[in-house]
């Protein structure tokens, strides 16, 4: 009941090409300490979309202020969506480790589909 859960409430999201897609994710606890990452796809070939800890992700903005104390909302918005962005996006909690952080728990995934830009 009290162990951290990763909540991705939408199982699917549909966005028109050129628009922004909001992918919602929240944690139910601040513990364990460690970063959040977003991936497209699962398994070894998954693509990193956003890393809370480091990196440059020009198309991604966070919906809430992640540095805010006690923040549990890790939703992201991806701008200028194209058909190449279609796929299943996973919000993943990592536990702080040494030397590397360890994956702790993943959300259920949100399928992003891209509609043709309205003419």
């Amino acid at each position: 009941e009290d162990e951290l859960q990763v909540i991705q409430p939408e199982k699917s999201v549909s966005v028109a090409a050129g628009e922004s897609a909001t992918l919602r994710c929240a944690m139910t606890s601040l513990i364990p300490v460690g970063p959040i990452m977003w991936f497209r796809g699962a398994g070894a070939g998954r693509e990193l979309i956003y890393n809370q800890k480091e990196g440059h992700f020009p198309r991604v903005t966070t919906v809430s202020e992640l540095t805010k104390r006690n923040n549990l909302d890790f939703s992201i918005s991806i701008s200028n969506i194209t058909p190449a962005d279609a796929g299943t996006y996973y919000c993943v909690k990592f536990r702080k480790g040494s030397p590397d952080d360890v994956e702790f728990k993943s959300g259920a995934g949100t399928e992003l589909s891209v509609r043709a830009k309205p003419s």
């Epitope: 409430p9 929240a26 139910t28 699962a42 259920a108």
Partner: antibody
Framework: QVQLVQSGAEVKKPGSSVKVSCKAS????????ISWVRQAPGQGLEWMGG????????NYAQKFQGRVTITADESTSTAYMELSSLRSEDTAVYYC???????????????WGQGTTVTVSS | DIVMTQSPLSLPVTPGEPASISCRSS???????????LDWYLQKPGQSPQLLIY???NRASGVPDRFSGSGSGTDFTLKISRVEAEDVGVYYC????????FGGGTKVEIK
């Protein structure tokens, strides 16, 4: 053990509004969805909408869009469902249910309130 | 909206005999994460509904093992291996792949 306790029966006039409460006890409130489901006399179950308190925003079935408002107060672990512009067809038992399917794939609607009877009559 | 269709509407059963209820969805309930977002509920007379099966085939806590769920995509089945008198009531399937919708219900009664 999580329990959901709903407010008591209501009798309302057509055109008025009703607000039903659902108080959770014994477990995490903010991280589960609370869904509202209604059942008209002799009819089946109908999902009206739901809210995940941790996000604060609600989703509604198209049929009830614009007429129903679902809110949650994390400080009191209580969810509310307000239905406006009542008509006789809204006479039903209204249930709240803890709904894990909105985020935690381990559960469906695994805890239900006892139901609140709303009668709409002139 | 995803439309859920249940059959039969009514199911007279004999205690000790098996029973089966079918549920069909207008769209696939299979997510790319491998889960089928289909639940089964039982509403006993005068009671609130109770969860029997979630994600197509997982028995909820405290549900007897005579209940089982199967199926994938658009076709699902709830089976009761040996019906008991306490199993009477209305059974509903519900999809949670999109905004939730219920099937019309199947009334199970003792012959």
């Amino acid at each position: 053990q999580v329990q959901l306790v709903q407010s008591g029966a209501e009798v309302k006039k057509p055109g008025s509004s009703v607000k039903v409460s659902c108080k959770a006890s014994g477990g995490t409130f903010s991280s589960y969805a609370i869904s509202w489901v209604r059942q008209a006399p002799g009819q089946g179950l109908e999902w009206m909408g739901g809210i995940i308190p941790i996000f604060g925003t609600a989703n509604y079935a198209q049929k009830f869009q614009g007429r129903v408002t679902i809110t949650a107060d994390e400080s009191t672990s209580t969810a509310y469902m307000e239905l406006s512009s009542l008509r006789s067809e809204d006479t039903a038992v209204y249930y709240c249910a803890r709904d894990g399917s909105a985020g935690r794939q381990e559960h469906g609607m695994d805890v239900w309130g006892q139901g609140t009877t709303v009668t709409v009559s002139s | 909206d995803i439309v859920m269709t249940q059959s039969p509407l009514s199911l007279p059963v004999t205690p000790g005999e098996p029973a089966s209820i079918s549920c069909r969805s207008s769209q696939s309930l299979l997510h790319s994460n491998g889960y089928n977002y289909l639940d089964w509920y039982l509403q006993k007379p005068g009671q609130s509904p109770q969860l029997l099966i979630y994600l197509g085939s997982n028995r909820a806590s405290g549900v007897p093992d005579r209940f089982s769920g199967s199926g994938s995509g658009t076709d699902f089945t709830l089976k009761i291996s040996r019906v008991e008198a306490e199993d009477v009531g209305v059974y509903y399937c519900m999809q949670a792949r999109g905004l939730p919708t219920f099937g019309g219900g199947t009334k199970v009664e003792i012959k």
